[in-house]
Amino acid sequence: PRSIDVKYIGVKSAYVSYDVQKRTIYLNITNTLNITNNNYYSVEVENITAQVQFSKTVIGKARLNNITIIGPLDMKQIDYTVPTVIAEEMSYMYDFCTLISIKVHNIVLMMQVTVTTTYFGHSEQISQERYQYVDCGRNTTYQLGQSEYLNVLQPQQ
């Protein structure tokens, strides 16, 4: 194939719920991805695998299968949701996320995503990693790109 470009756009929404007894935070994070097919033929996106890390610990994973077919010289925007759980050794975060005295409870999460396309039995994988701010204290919808966290660890595209 000539090339398939994958661009992680950002967090679209984050919906939060809590388990008071277990001091656990549940975050359903919906992300947006742009996949561009620069070939002169259609390409099949076989699967998208994603995981979310908080403080170097994987807190959520997701996999979407048989996603879509992208036409030549075309782009498709795909949303995918990763259910995450902040619990156990990270239960100290429960206090921060439920603290009433602060308005925004932003935490920094690392979003990893891998897009797999299959070409006559040969798989091609394209991966992206991005750090993003997510509010763990309330349900939030974001303007695309609004949640981006820029630091020296995150290479600029």
Partner: antibody
Framework: QVQLQQSGAELIRPGTSVKVSCKAS????????IEWVKQRPGQGLEWIGV????????NYNEKFKGKAKLTADKSSSTAYMQLSSLTSEDSAVYFC???????????????WGQGTSVTVSS | DIQMTQSPSSLSASLGERVSLTCRAS??????LNWLQQEPDGTIKRLIY???SLDSGVPKRFSGSRSGSDYSLTISSLESEDFVDYYC?????????FGGGTKLEIK
């Protein structure tokens, strides 16, 4: 039947621009690519670029970047090629060509327009 | 860019004769090759796609084949309307590139 009807011959002054049209009929315009090819008098064929009329996505031969601009109007099933800053080197016949494709397969240039002659002269 | 070297550039032959035109690719193009025919009035039509598949409506006297990086168009028995120009086209990579053409003339 599939037809690609191109606009008529053009006589253009150097330094100006021209827009060549290619009206498609007999098939679903957005289900195929449209490519453009140049042929100078008595010479061979040269690929300019390609457009997906459905998405508007384009790709150009490096040689024609900045020279050619490809567009398409879905409502009229018409593809356009604009050539700018014309010189005598741009005097040629320009063809629009339909290309079919599938998933991981391409069968390009199955139907050709009749060609549009562009002459650049002062 | 992939170079397509087409030979001969011109060929004189007689009616009923069998002729072959060749294109050599500078890089591997698999079976991604077309043969095109151009009439004196400029009209172009595709004869063969994917190296050896005949387009609908094209006479069976035309055939395409491959041997390594050499691609051939063969006309088994020349008819009067075959004395025109022929081009090969590779579409394995961008930019698409054409052979220099073969002018088929009547002897």
């Amino acid at each position: 039947q599939v037809q690609l009807q191109q606009s008529g011959a053009e006589l253009i002054r150097p330094g100006t621009s021209v827009k060549v049209s290619c009206k498609a009929s007999g098939y679903a315009f957005t289900d195929y690519l449209i490519e453009w090819v140049k042929q100078r008098p008595g010479q061979g064929l040269e690929w300019i670029g390609v457009i997906n009329p459905g998405s508007g996505g384009t790709n150009y031969n490096e040689k024609f970047k900045g020279k050619a601009k490809l567009t398409a109007d879905k409502s009229s099933s018409t593809a356009y090629m604009q050539l700018s800053s014309l010189t005598s080197e741009d005097s040629a016949v320009y063809f629009c060509v339909r290309s079919s494709y599938g998933v991981y397969v391409a069968y390009p240039m199955d139907y050709w327009g009749q060609g549009t002659s562009v002459t650049v002269s002062s | 860019d992939i170079q397509m070297t087409q030979s001969p550039s011109s060929l004189s032959a007689s009616l009923g004769e069998r002729v072959s035109l060749t294109c050599r690719a500078s890089q591997d193009i698999g079976s991604n090759l077309n043969w095109l025919q151009q009439e004196p009035d400029g009209t172009i039509k595709r004869l063969i796609y994917a190296t050896s598949s005949l387009d609908s409506g094209v006479p069976k006297r035309f055939s395409g084949s491959r041997s390594g990086s050499d691609y051939s168009l063969t006309i088994s028995s020349l008819e009067s309307e075959d004395f025109v120009d022929y081009y090969c086209l590779q579409y394995a990579s961008s930019p698409r590139t054409f052979g220099g053409g073969t002018k088929l003339e009547i002897k």
